[in-house]
Interface confidence: low
């Protein structure tokens, strides 16, 4: 059973009065329709909820919100609804908070339809203050902050036009029209694409990219025949079009656009698509859709410069063009991604991969669980956990898996144990040691937090009916106290906390019913009195990351490096603090084969560390194009991964020599494009000739490196069909995460290409 | 409590190169940055560059690329600032000082707790 | 590089006086900006961090204020030890650089 309150547990002494003086209630005066709820800035206290209630009438909409504004933690609210003259905010923009500590906050406002341009209401007092602007332009997306400057606004209008602010929205100029998509870049550069005839849908595929690096003084255009772009750590992708027929490939840029190599991934038909599931500034994860309805593609993961692409996983599971995936980034451990896959019998596995892709395992079957009905072997099954996908068809799985960077190696999920996703009612489940172990934590779905980096979980109970009791646990979810926060249930609808996991601060956010009305209401707990004191150097221990056989000299080492961490100890009761910094010593670990991807022209044979040659490049000077430029390749068939920091050990022989030859791939850079030959004729005909005399040979090595529809078996195969039975393997990426960090609702924006 | 303890006075000759070291005490050694500061006799601060004791990075300012070198140890809890082709206006006091920790920035808060200094001068 | 320019560079006071430094970055540094105290003979002491935040231990007449280029520290009311040089430190972009000083002295 799972673990709760029995003789084992320790009870924390008097936490029912402790949490009774620090449970602080406050019921928002207004009808309950939506609500939502930001942080603003990091360790300020300062929360922002605005409440929505729409009444759609016959000729009109009748709608009204209020703004509240709390500095502590959510104990206390202020209505501040006067501060933005009771206008009503049109929440599909949300509200727009400023990157790091700026204390920023945009309100899109809902203005009547004959208005020449929006309103918007700004802050840059973490929301004491607010300034009324009346726009030149209609928005169509919210206000997108320059992650390097604050204030530094863009925005797309209705008109498709790009607008720049450079004093936070005070002053606002339309810099481009004809714009589909603008994202910012590095250095405070704007990425967007134009298109040049009728519109975004209609020129799909035909839209240049365009960058500025001076917000709109000067323009420069880096690729034509664009279907989409995207960014992800230090890579700029672009999809474009094929010249002969209707498939796009990938394209990628680590110079901003300047120049372009040909990403060696499988193209692309029109119903397909690309998605950049996660990238740092090592590599990329890249899901290749596969042709027809299937729901699944294929997961590659790339070199350092993102071109080069070794097959990481087959049927991976993700629905359609901006549909569901279960691509999960492990945050509390370097190296681990969880999703799951599509298996040839249409259910659906979870698998794991702790190396960064390199291998892919089933979860371990966790030691208190039995195997369920889906399992043929009811001796050996395998733990499988409940993302995205499961939230979208309505299962009842209230929450997806979390993970917080600075609670090492703790991951929660909900999942079942069997040989495929159940879509019986699931329970809670808690790795300790980054997803190779797993123990059931609490039966029945639940909501979820991550308090104090780690030294409290806080859980409640998913049900239709009105609850009043929440449980927490001071032990890594080992043991449970349950605390009734309130006599009155509420009709729960979300758990809050701060993002980054660090607060001691827990809302509970609901509603109460009664005849005729219903009013929102929240509950702030404060746990600061159950962790009584600071955490001192005995209440840590150290803890090696990715250890899985102790014997070995060698364990721990995850793309060439082992980290130790020091761990609070499950059975200290303290608090970290809002200071706490994860504590790691890393050491590094020799060289072996497992540190390297295949090379150009090479693959990994299935259950084989070494690569070996492709069959149909034996013999041939192996030649590639890159950023413009034929290069000649001396290897013997590795590359070292993307983030490998081994040292001695195998050390492969790599050469690449600069042919001093131009090549071109279909994405030609618009000068190029338009560039008229002025060279006699006679020139010309003589290097055809010349040309037609190698083109036998060049041609079979371009078909396969430089070009072309490419064969899946190009693709150093780390791992064709997941095994069920290898765990090893094992690190590490940092990726640029796609979540909205201080609001209230995970925001998932994966680039689709 | 907590502090850094720096290693005592040193003459120099031009051309030679002197090694500064800051032992911390207190704190997890590991978890806070170390930045490296100098001031010449009457003048103000010059900030050199820092170590990240975790991993061993380190950023220095452009004026001393390729003469500055910072190490640690954390078996010891120390770090060390090794100035190589010393001049005459490399006379200074020099500064170990931490980092001050907050969540994300860890250049963006100041510097908390400072060594008493160490008095370097370059003399022929 | 961004350059911090403090002033003034020298200002007399009495015990009891309000103070105000000043100190201009060369362009826009957020709010992160830091304040020193530096006594002869002695290491600097972090008085103010992220522009406006008092470092713990620092007494309550100290204060800071301003964002973007424009900053200033106040000490409502001069103490006898208070008579130093400040300085104040963007940490905004790298590399991190100091203003000039100013000296705080007796009237």
């Known amino acids: 059973s799972a673990p709760g309150e029995d003789e084992e547990c320790g009870r924390v002494r008097d936490f029912v009065a402790k949490l009774a003086n620090n449970t602080h209630q406050h019921v928002f005066d207004d009808l309950a329709g939506s609500v939502s709820l930001s942080w603003v800035g990091d360790s300020t206290g300062v929360i922002l909820v605005l409440t929505t209630f729409h009444v759609p009438l016959v000729i009109m909409t009748f709608g009204q919100s209020k703004l509240y504004r709390s500095e502590d933690y959510g104990k206390n609210f202020k209505d501040i609804t006067d501060l933005i003259n009771n206008t009503f905010i049109r929440t599909e923009f949300g509200m727009a908070i400023g990157p790091e500590n700026s204390g920023k906050v945009v309100l899109t406002a809902e203005v009547s339809g004959g208005s020449r341009g929006g309103r918007i209401f700004r802050s840059s007092d973490f929301a004491k203050n607010f300034v009324q602007t009346d726009l030149p332009f209609h928005p169509l997306t919210q206000m997108m902050y320059s992650p390097q400057n604050s204030d530094y606004l863009l925005a797309l209008s209705t008109e498709n036009g790009l607008w720049v602010s450079k004093n936070f929205g005070g002053k606002w100029e339309e810099i481009h029209k004809a714009v589909c998509l603008a994202k910012w870049g590095s250095d405070n550069t704007i990425f967007f694409t134009t298109y040049a005839n009728g519109s975004c849908k209609a020129d799909l595929g035909a839209l240049e990219l365009w960058r500025t690096s001076d917000l709109g003084k000067s323009f420069k255009t880096i690729g034509v025949k664009i279907y989409s772009f995207g960014l992800g750590g230090r890579f700029l992708f672009a999809s474009v079009m094929a010249d002969k027929d209707t498939t796009r490939r990938i394209h990628v840029s680590t110079d901003q656009g300047d120049t372009w190599s040909m990403a060696q991934l499988p193209s692309v038909g029109q119903e397909q698509f690309y998605s950049i599931l996660a990238a740092n500034d090592d590599m990329v994860f890249m899901h290749v859709d596969e042709p027809g309805d299937t729901g699944f593609g294929t997961i590659f993961t790339s070199d350092d410069r993102g071109i080069v692409y070794s097959k990481s996983l087959d049927r991976h599971l993700y629905t359609t063009t901006g549909g569901e995936t279960d691509f999960t980034n492990v945050t509390s451990l370097r190296g681990v991604y969880i999703t799951s896959v599509l298996s040839e019998d249409n259910s659906i596995q979870t698998m794991i991969t702790f190396d960064q892709g390199g291998r892919w395992t089933h979860l371990r079957k966790p030691e208190n669980s039995e195997c369920d009905a889906t399992a043929k072997n009811k001796n050996e099954c395998s733990l499988h956990i409940h993302a995205s996908y499961s939230i979208s068809q309505k299962l009842n799985v209230p929450m997806a898996p979390l993970s917080e960077p600075n609670a090492v190696g703790i991951v929660i999920a909900h999942g079942s144990v069997g040989d495929a996703i159940s879509v019986m009612v699931p329970d809670v489940y808690i790795s300790d040691d980054g997803g190779y172990s797993w123990t059931k934590m609490l039966e029945g779905p639940h909501y979820y937090t991550i308090l104090d980096s780690g030294g409290i979980i806080v859980a409640i109970e998913h049900s239709s009916r009105p609850i009043n009791v929440i449980k927490f646990s001071t032990d890594e979810g080992q043991c449970w106290q349950t605390y009734t926060f309130t006599r009155d249930p509420i009709y729960f609808t979300g758990l809050a906390s701060e993002p980054g996991a660090r607060s001691m601060n827990i809302s509970i956010w609901g509603f109460t019913e009664s005849f005729l009305t219903s009013q929102w209401v929240s509950y702030t707990i404060d746990f600061k009195d159950i962790l009584e004191r600071n955490c001192e150097e005995k209440d840590y221990t150290i803890w090696l990351a990715h250890s899985t056989d102790p014997e070995d000299y060698e364990d721990g080492c995850i793309l060439g490096y082992k980290e130790q961490f020091l761990r609070l100890r499950k059975s200290s009761v303290c608090q970290n603090g809002r200071d706490y910094v994860v504590t790691k010593q890393p050491s590094i670990c020799l060289c072996s084969l497992e540190d390297f991807l295949c090379d150009f022209g090479y693959y990994r044979p299935e259950n084989d560390s070494k690569c070996v040659e492709q069959p149909e490049l034996k013999g041939h000077d192996l030649e590639f194009c890159l950023y413009g430029r034929e290069e000649h390749l001396t290897t013997n068939g590795y590359r070292k991964i993307p983030g490998d920091k081994c040292q001695g050990g195998v050390n492969p022989v790599r050469e690449v020599k600069d042919l001093k030859k131009k090549c071109t791939s279909n994405f030609l850079s618009p000068e190029k494009q338009n560039s008229k030959s002025n060279s006699v004729p006679i020139i010309l005909a003589i290097v055809g000739l010349m040309l037609v005399t190698v083109v036998a040979g060049v041609l079979i090595v371009k078909k396969y490196v430089c070009g072309g529809r490419f064969l899946v078996h190009r693709y150093s195969v780390l791992q064709q069909h997941a095994e069920a039975n290898g765990v090893d393997g094992v690190d590490a990426l940092d990726t640029a995460s796609h979540t909205n960090k201080s609001g209230y609702h995970d925001d998932s924006d994966e680039d689709l290409l | 409590q907590v502090q850094l303890v720096q290693s005592g006075a040193e003459v120099k000759k031009p051309g030679a190169s002197v090694k500064v070291s800051c032992k911390a005490s207190?704190?997890?050694?590991?978890?806070?940055?170390m930045h490296w500061v100098r001031q010449a006799p009457g003048q103000g601060l010059e900030w050199m560059g820092w170590?990240?004791?975790?991993?061993?990075?380190?950023r220095y300012a452009q004026k001393f690329q390729g003469r500055v070198t910072m190490t640690r140890d954390t078996s010891i809890s120390t770090a060390y600032m090794e100035l190589s082709r010393l001049r005459s206006d490399d006379t200074a006091v020099y500064y170990c000082?931490?980092?001050?920790?907050?969540?994300?920035?860890?250049?963006?808060?100041?510097?908390?707790?400072w060594g008493q200094g160490t008095t370097v001068t370059v003399s022929s | 590089d961004i350059q911090m320019t403090q002033s003034p560079s020298s200002l007399s006071a009495s015990v009891g006086d309000r103070v105000t430094i000043t100190c201009r970055a060369s362009q826009s540094i957020s709010s992160y900006l830091n304040w020193y105290q530096q006594k002869p003979g002695k290491a600097p002491k972090l008085l103010i961090y992220a522009a406006s935040s008092l470092q713990s231990g620092v007494p309550s007449r100290f204060s800071g204020s301003g964002s973007g280029t424009d900053f200033t520290l106040t000490i409502s009311s001069l103490q006898p030890e208070d008579f130093a040089t400040y300085y104040c430190?963007?940490?905004?972009?790298?590399?991190?650089?100091f203003g000039g000083g100013t000296k705080v002295e007796i009237k």
């Open positions: 207190g704190y997890t050694f590991v978890a806070y940055y």
């Open positions: 000082a931490r980092g001050k920790r907050s969540s994300g920035w860890y250049e963006g808060y100041g510097m908390d707790v």
């Open positions: 430190q963007q940490s905004d972009v790298s590399p991190i650089t």
């Open positions: 170590i990240n004791p975790n991993s061993g990075a380190t």
